[in-house]
Amino acid sequence: KNLKSPQKVEVDIIDDNFILRWNRSDESVGNVTFSFDYQKTGMDNWIKLSGCQNITSTKCNFSSLKLNVYEEIKLRIRAEKENTSSWYEVDSFTPFRKAQIGPPEVHLEAEDKAIVIHISPGTKDSVMWALDGLSFTYSLVIWKNSSGVEERIENIYSRHKIYKLSPETTYCLKVKAALLTSWKIGVYSPVHCIKTTVENELPPPENIEVSVQNQNYVLKWDYTYANMTFQVQWLHAFLKRNPGNHLYKWKQIPDCENVKTTQCVFPQNVFQKGIYLLRVQASDGNNTSFWSEEIKFDTEIQAFLLPPVFNIRSLSDSFHIYIGAPKQSGNTPVIQDYPLIYEIIFWENTSNAERKIIEKKTDVTVPNLKPLTVYCVKARAHTMDEKLNKSSVFSDAVCEKTKPGNTSK
């Protein structure tokens, strides 16, 4: 009886794993083996595919074959018993084009209200992605184990920290890789779960802001308790994109080590031009907080995008606010070349209820105010340029009293 050729050959490539699967054409014939040959582009001869000779199952692995992953290859398969079937040729393919990104490796660290996720490619020193290793981005799905409500986070790098979580709570997540340059989306990792720790005695510092005063940067933050010491560290932002090493060498800002106030001042020349991450930690001598959320700090923008200066003309039921360019000794605000948008926050002095106005104009009316009432106003500038999505810090608050009831004109 003539043996039939195997059919429906599928080539699965995940990272550097090359797997072939096929269907037996005749289930009734026993003790059949299968063999593959391959042919490279521009070659006439066929070569035996090592790892896929005299296979008794309908699956084989040819990962050991050192192929140029960017070069097209062709495969053929036949069945063998006493005689052999005719060859069945598989459509030619380029391994790199066909390859899928495998599940990444994931390691988790827990804090009380945060989880640190370390992600690395599932195949170390992969041949398939050798030229693309630096281009991997990742996305993840995270959920509370108890609720199952999923949150998706896109475009993250090899280390990512998720904040604002609940203490003593189990969170689960899965991660997949993407190579956007090649339009490739990977396979999800297995689900990893971790429980956040008991709430720390000391919370991390919050609301970190950087401003410029003369030739110095002023770093301010909020903290719950008094009599604390703080330290501030910085890291080049680009290092977060470096997948190679899991050690981030955060550096101390010398003038911000063991400071006893919720601010520190350091010279602008501490930082060369660039984008940095800053973080702050609190200590009371016995206990240490976890690190604050990291803030991005761009020296180019920080030096120029200063909080707006404004004047207030008070009426009985409104304020007229006139916004001018910030005055800075020896520091021309270059950023004025960019269109700015102004965020104005105002509140009744005796209340915490803030209201917000966003305006492109430099003269703004704050309506619906009560007569003879003290209101406070602060403002900040935002760039409208998409590539340069930056904000200044808020100006200091200015408080004014509205006029008596008959002066609305």
Epitope: L108, E109, T197, H246, L247, K251, N286, N287, T288, F290
Partner: antibody, heavy 118, light 107 residues
Framework: QVQLVQSGAEVKKPGASVKLSCKAS????????IHWVKQAPGQGLEWIGR????????KYAPKFQGRVTMTADTSISTAYMELSRLRSDDTVVYYC???????????WGQGTLVTVSS | DIQMTQSPSSLSTSVGDRVTITCKTS??????VAWYQQKPGKAPKPLIY???YRYSGVPSRFSGSGSGTDFTLTISSLQPEDFATYYC?????????FGPGTKVDIK
């Protein structure tokens, strides 16, 4: 493969100084921190400090501050620890270790025994 | 400084036994705890990092768990080569510290 090879045993007199070396191979020393740990005979492990070989930034345990100096020569992939004003209770084994972020101290040297005796 | 305590300080046990060593820290260190095994005259050998991850080449009978201030090293079925001293180590904040050690010897 990754290796940390430490210098040989030393015998010193009280009040003297000793400089130990830790030669790294199989990795770029600039990408990691090198830590030093001491262990007295029959006792536990005690952290002395660490150096970032890339820029020579150091952190020392308060107990050793002022008496220990860590340096590195990246051109020969070697970290050093100098301990001054030696006392008899400095008769211990000193280990260097590679620190790799959340991987902690993932490789250790074989240790150097320093004996302080008059 | 963060203080670390380990219990028990020593234990006598037999091959095949399940062994649990606990480590307490004086403050919350997240999951920044590692475990090392040391035999006489040898350098410490890394077993577990980040509380629960085994270093490559470490047998699966070794496992770590815990977070915050309470950590555990478990050896599911003790083998002859496991008789040694075990140290926990916090690398959350400077100065880094080690536990005093737990000596596991033959009953």
């Amino acid at each position: 493969q990754v290796q940390l090879v430490q210098s040989g045993a030393e015998v010193k007199k009280p009040g003297a100084s000793v400089k130990l070396s830790c030669k790294a191979s199989g990795f770029n020393i600039k990408d990691y921190y090198i830590h030093w740990v001491k262990q007295a005979p029959g006792q536990g492990l005690e952290w002395i400090g660490r150096i970032d070989p890339e820029d020579a930034e150091t952190k020392y345990a308060p107990k050793f501050q002022g008496r220990v100096t860590m340096t590195a020569d990246t051109s020969i992939s070697t970290a050093y620890m100098e301990l001054s004003r030696l006392r008899s209770d400095d008769t211990v084994v000193y280990y260097c270790g590679r620190y790799h972020g959340y991987w902690a101290l993932d490789y250790w040297g074989q240790g150097t025994l320093v004996t302080v005796s008059s | 400084d963060i203080q670390m305590t380990q219990s028990p300080s020593s234990l006598s046990t037999s091959v095949g036994d399940r062994v649990t060593i606990t480590c307490k820290t004086s403050q919350n260190v997240g999951t920044n705890v590692a475990w090392y095994q040391q035999k006489p005259g040898k350098a410490p050998k890394p077993l577990i990092y980040s509380t629960s991850y085994r270093y490559s080449g470490v047998p699966s009978r070794f496992s770590g768990s815990g977070s915050g201030t309470d950590f555990t090293l478990t050896i599911s079925s003790l083998q002859p080569e496991d008789f040694a001293t075990y140290y926990c180590h916090q690398y959350f904040s400077y100065p880094y510290t080690f536990g005093p050690g737990t000596k596991v010897d033959i009953k």
